[in-house]
Interface confidence: medium
């Protein structure tokens, strides 16, 4: 592009600028210790300082500690980035009753709809399950009309009447206090994301390309420096690589300078709800449970509600789906794997106190 040559020439001999062939213009070279906030900085104000690991640059240009999701009832929603805090939310199966900045101060288990009620809105990390009366002609066993099929479809009738509205009855939900490890964690294996980033893979950007080690004058090989664990997307923006820090995920491909990390379910698990470059929900495979079943959930951000099956029922245990598809396509409507120890302490949200019998089955404690 001959018309661009004059611009390129003006960069030569000017140590504070370099020519970026990608954008075909002169760019300001950020000084030592400073990093560009855009692909082609034009002035010193387009450069920023780097905060320490687990710190982010707030609106006042101060390095502020990212919140940690180290409590048992929290998981990482978004990672700690250069300009924003890590965000924590209640782990699947729980909702936030007392919010905190970028986190939640108190998480409660989702309520289970009582007999004669059906789920109107499934619980999320922010909201409890909302129930509504079953409409006439629809079996109370159906969570929604589209799920009212023959029992062979895997739908299990709801059990154990429990109050629903957190506004009227705080006793209907069970908080996790003092880091107590509840068996729901053992059953679902959905533990917290670690505070420290994954050490798997390689740095998302090559320190040799950092503006602290200026690129050769006029070099087109000097690409934008993204933060650790970020990649340069097609639009030239630094985008966070997905995190495989959930217990049920493993890294398939690492975070590279121009592509995201990809995650897949760990061995022995299959993806029930896919997500970009990752899996929103992994379930064990084969999927057999002795005492616990899950309600089907379609939306990735909506959480599974754990329930006890009605007495005398037992979910099917099929090593392979009935339609003969590969495990990856297995429906998430089957139950999660629970070992005999975990089933002894499975929380059953209920308005009455719960005791555990010697058999490990929850029993209602009348007082």
């Amino acid at each position: 592009f001959p018309q661009d040559r004059p611009f390129e020439d003006t960069c030569h001999g000017n140590p504070s600028h370099y020519y970026d062939k990608a954008v075909r213009r002169c760019c300001y070279r950020c000084p030592m210790g400073l990093f560009p906030t855009q692909q082609c900085p034009q002035r010193p104000t387009d450069c920023r300082k780097q905060c320490e690991p687990d710190y982010y640059l707030d609106e006042a240009d101060r390095c502020t500690a990212c919140v940690t999701c180290s409590r048992d009832d929290l998981v990482e929603k978004t990672p700690c980035a250069w300009n924003s805090s890590r965000v924590c939310e209640c782990r699947p199966g729980m909702f936030c009753s007392t919010s905190a900045v970028n986190s939640c101060a108190r998480c409660f288990f989702h309520s289970v709809c009582p007999a004669g009620m059906i789920v109107k809105f499934p619980g999320t990390a922010q909201k409890n399950t909302v129930c509504e009366p079953a409409s006439p002609g629809v079996s109370p066993a159906c969570a929604s009309p589209e799920n009212c099929k023959e029992p062979s479809s895997g739908t299990i009738p709801q059990a154990k009447p429990t109050p629903v509205s957190p506004a009227t009855s705080s006793a209907s939900t069970m908080p996790v206090r003092g880091g107590t490890r509840l068996a729901q964690e053992a059953a679902s294996k959905l533990t917290r994301a670690p505070d420290s980033p994954s050490s798997v893979g390689r740095p998302s950007s090559d320190p040799g390309l950092s503006p602290t080690q200026p690129c050769p004058e006029g070099s087109g090989d000097c690409r934008k420096q993204c933060e650790p664990d970020y990649y340069l997307d097609e639009a030239g923006r630094c985008t966070a690589c997905v995190s495989c820090s959930r217990d049920d995920l493993v890294e398939k491909t690492p975070c590279a300078w121009n592509s995201s990390r990809t995650c897949e379910c760990r061995p022995g698990m299959i993806c029930a709800t896919s997500a970009t470059n990752s899996c929103a929900r992994c379930v064990p495979y084969p999927i057999c449970a002795a005492e616990t079943v899950t309600k089907p959930q379609d939306m990735a951000e909506k959480d599974t509600t754990f329930e006890a099956p009605p007495l005398g029922t037992q979910p099917d245990c099929n090593p392979t789906p009935e339609n003969g598809e590969a495990p990856a396509s297995t429906s998430p409507t089957q139950s999660l794997l629970v070992d005999s120890q975990a089933s002894k302490t499975l929380p059953i949200p209920t308005s009455a106190p719960v005791a555990l019998s010697s058999t490990g089955k929850p029993v209602l404690d009348a007082g």
């Epitope: 000084p31 030592m32 210790g33 400073l34 990093f35 300082k49 780097q50 320490e52 690991p53 687990d54 710190y55 006042a60 240009d61 101060r62 390095c63 500690a65 420290s196 980033p197 994954s198 050490s199 798997v200 893979g201 390689r202 740095p203 998302s204 950007s205 320190p207 950092s210 602290t212 420096q225 933060e227 650790p228 664990d229 690492p254 975070c255």
Partner: antibody, heavy 121, light 111 residues
Framework: EVQLQQSGAELVKPGASVKLSCTAS????????MHWVKQRPEQGLEWIGR????????IYDPNFQGKATITAYTSSNTAYLQLSSLTSEDTAVYYC??????????????WGAGTTVTVSS | DIVLTQSPASLAVSLGQRATISCRAS??????????MQWYQQKPGQPPKLLIY???NVESGVPARFTGSGSGTDFSLNIHPVEEDDIAMYFC?????????FGGGTKLEIK
């Protein structure tokens, strides 16, 4: 040449305060972070904290919160460490150091010669 | 806080031989695939001097006799061949988590 020039030795009484200085040459302190490190006689190194001279943003080791105050003046290219309510435990050499920060590295690349503080009645 | 444990506390090596100093962290200091561990040399009456940063990168001006290795929680500094000028205290330091912490130090002596 990049250098950090620290103020001279101090002999102070218990309960008093002292303010140490660290003047940079060869670079602008507002483009970096300035750290302070403590070293007691015949002992290891302890990180006290750091300041972003561009805006006064500080981070301290909780063990030094209340004991140490780090400030900086970009006009004089100088960082300061003030130590209050001094006791014999504060007798040490105090170093200032430049923090070098990158995409995958954070370290002290330039150190001052140190200032000896002796607390004695 | 991340605690760094250096071993040995003192080390006597013959000239021309190899000296190995270890540093173990109480938790991982990895950050996106890089171990945020540094090594410093300190001679009596002098400030510490940076030798190695990010586990294995040799600071400019430092002799190639100094090498760093390790990942996760275990790191080491190797000096080979050891020279008279290497008599000093050596400290490891992590910058993975605030507060940044140092190891207790290893005193290198010549046999």
């Amino acid at each position: 040449e990049v250098q950090l020039q620290q103020s001279g030795a101090e002999l102070v009484k218990p309960g008093a305060s002292v303010k140490l200085s660290c003047t940079a040459s060869g670079f602008n302190i507002k483009d970096t972070y300035m750290h302070w490190v403590k070293q007691r006689p015949e002992q290891g190194l302890e990180w006290i904290g750091r300041i972003d001279p561009a805006n006064g943003d500080t981070i301290y080791d909780p063990n030094f919160q209340g004991k140490a105050t780090i400030t900086a003046y970009t006009s004089s290219n100088t960082a300061y460490l003030q130590l209050s309510s001094l006791t014999s435990e504060d007798t040490a050499v105090y170093y200032c150091a430049r923090g070098y920060y990158g995409s995958s590295y954070w370290y002290f690349d330039v150190w001052g010669a140190g200032t000896t503080v002796t607390v004695s009645s | 806080d991340i605690v760094l444990t250096q071993s040995p506390a003192s080390l006597a090596v013959s000239l021309g031989q190899r000296a190995t100093i270890s540093c173990r962290a109480s938790e991982s200091v990895e950050y996106y695939g890089t171990g945020l561990m540094q090594w410093y040399q300190q001679k009596p009456g002098q400030p510490p001097k940076l030798l190695i940063y990010s586990a294995s990168n040799v600071e400019s001006g430092v002799p190639a006799r100094f090498t760093g290795s390790g990942s996760g929680t275990d790191f080491s500094l190797n000096i080979h061949p050891v020279e008279e000028d290497d008599i000093a205290m050596y400290f490891c330091q992590q910058s993975r988590k605030v507060p940044w912490t140092f190891g207790g130090g290893t005193k290198l002596e010549i046999k």
